[in-house]
């Protein structure tokens, strides 16, 4: 990996449980200023596989509030506006970090966590199986 | 919101920078024990609207790796294997949470970062600009 | 060879039309998408319009929409541009590019060029 | 409509990096391509896909593509590299190839 020369101005780390333990501070800094927000926001109705967006909530978690898809149809939409089951609707999912309270509760007090979400769906060629 | 009962086992917060500043066990905790992670380890091949991964590397950031999807093409892929500029490959973003090391090059302080990722591509319907 | 030759240019008056024709040798014509871009005297590029290989899709610049009509003919080996309601503004050097297999974002043989110019 | 900005000028010392900027909003997430056109010439293509080289093209042209800019480097700038530089994408919302306005590399 590479190595980084370590910063002198480094809060003291003379903890038995570090390096598990860090500090965080949660004033979040958002990278994304010159995007805009409208642009991918219908893509969930005008995909050949649409989904639905569904929400998922958890006081314990951070952010406490997540937004699942899940594919409306099993095939994927065609030329004519009909679902065409030569092909398939499949979610892309990731996984992604999340806080969660240990021990639960506390409000300064977190574990990362990796959860995999379901982003969206594309629209696949389906693997077929000989049957012999 | 939510409220919820202080455990009273949590650590102590009688910090002047609480509730900004919290503590957090990097001992990552995986919740996708029975997912299959060759699932959707093709889609991006099999997908009528392809994309290709991009390592994103940065060693001030957790987690240092991010992969990002690109859309191979303008149109999507027709049942002949061919580009189709009547549909427009897309790329589906998310917002994600990563820590950055605050101060730089610090091993154990960290600062909460929202990036916006492009986690694979979808197929949609373009909307149709008319010229006067 | 590998080339694209493009032919057709000339001076014409406004509101007048022109036809392009290119003629691609040394290479399977028929499994690339082309397209034709623009330069203006003194000017940088720009892209006109696109045609998939088999000529089902095509896509056009918003300033040329409406006026402009792409086509090819596999057979001959020929990309073709159509260009009625010719402006002032329309004058330039139009090249002929093909699609590179690996993507649109990317033109991986150009023509020679040819003028067109648009004046009364 | 997406817009692709580029210096109009960078000069360079024979021998010395030359490096040629291409802004566009949040285009880490477009793949970028390279032109090069000498005087009186066709477009070349030079780089594809932000960082590929066609065959035939030196290895002294190199690209990359991350945040809002895309890069073209030459390294051990020639003479003979003196051109006018233009980049592409396209652009989903206006189903549209965009280049910039191009950049006319000098070599002193």
């Known amino acids: 990996g590479i190595t980084i020369p370590r910063n002198p101005g480094c809060p003291n780390s003379e903890d038995k449980n570090f390096p598990r333990t860090v500090m965080v501070n949660l004033n979040i800094h958002n990278r994304n200023t010159n995007t805009n927000p409208k642009r991918s926001s219908d893509y969930y109705n005008r995909s050949t596989s649409p989904w639905n967006l569904h929400r998922n909530e958890d006081p314990e978690r951070y952010p406490s509030v997540i937004w699942e898809a899940k594919c409306r149809h099993l095939g994927c939409i065609n030329a004519d506006g009909n679902v065409d089951y030569h092909m398939n609707s499949v979610p892309i999912q990731q996984e992604i970090l999340v806080l969660r309270r240990e021990p639960p509760h506390c409000p300064n007090s977190f574990r990362l966590e990796k959860i995999l979400v379901s982003v969206g769906c594309t629209c696949v060629t389906p693997i077929v199986h000989h049957v012999a | 919101g939510i409220t919820i009962p202080r455990n009273p086992g949590c650590p102590n917060s009688e910090d002047k920078n609480f509730p900004r500043t919290v503590m957090v066990n990097l001992n990552i905790h995986n919740r996708n024990t029975n997912t299959n992670p060759k699932r959707s380890s093709d889609y991006y091949n099999r997908s009528t609207s392809p994309w290709n991964l991009h390592r994103n590397e940065d060693p001030e950031r957790y987690p240092s790796v991010i992969w990002e999807a690109k859309c191979r093409h303008l149109g999507c892929i027709n049942a002949d294997g061919n580009v189709d500029y009547h549909m427009n490959s897309v790329p589906i973003q998310q917002e994600i949470l990563v820590l950055r090391r605050e101060p730089p090059h610090c091993p154990n302080s960290f600062r909460l970062e929202k990036i916006l990722v492009s986690v694979g591509c979808t197929c949609v319907t373009p909307i149709v600009h008319h010229v006067a | 060879q590998v080339q694209l030759v493009e032919s057709g240019g000339g001076v014409v008056q406004p509101g007048r039309s022109l036809r392009l024709s290119c003629a691609a040798s040394?290479?399977?014509?028929?499994?690339?998408?082309m397209h034709w871009v623009r330069q203006a005297p003194g000017k940088g590029l720009e892209w006109v319009t696109l045609?998939?290989?088999?000529?089902?899709?095509?896509l056009y610049g918003d300033s040329v929409k409406g006026r402009f009509t792409i086509s090819r003919d596999n057979s001959k080996n020929s990309l073709y541009l159509q260009m009625n309601s010719l402006r002032a503004e329309d004058t330039a050097v139009y090249y002929c590019?093909?699609?590179?297999?690996?993507?649109?974002?990317?033109?991986?043989?150009w023509g020679q060029g040819t003028l067109v110019t648009v004046s009364s | 409509s997406y817009e692709l900005t580029q210096p109009p000028s960078v000069s360079v010392s024979p021998g010395q990096t030359a490096s040629i900027t291409c802004s566009g909003d949040?285009?880490?997430?477009?793949?970028v391509s390279w032109y090069q056109q000498k005087p009186g010439q066709s477009p070349v293509l030079v780089i594809y896909?932000?960082?590929r080289r066609p065959s035939g093209i030196p290895e002294r042209f190199s690209g990359s593509n991350s945040g809002n800019t895309a890069t073209l480097t030459i390294s051990g700038t020639q003479a003979m590299d003196e051109a006018d530089y233009y980049c592409?994408?396209?652009?989903?919302?206006?189903?549209?190839?965009?280049f910039g306005g191009g950049t006319k590399l000098t070599v002193l």
């Open positions: 949040n285009l880490r997430t477009k793949y």
């Open positions: 045609i998939s290989f088999d000529g089902r899709s095509k």
């Open positions: 592409m994408t396209w652009d989903v919302d206006t189903t549209s190839m965009i």
């Open positions: 896909q932000d960082t």
């Open positions: 040394g290479f399977a014509f028929g499994s690339y998408t």
């Open positions: 590019a093909r699609g590179s297999v690996r993507g649109e974002a990317a033109f991986d043989l």
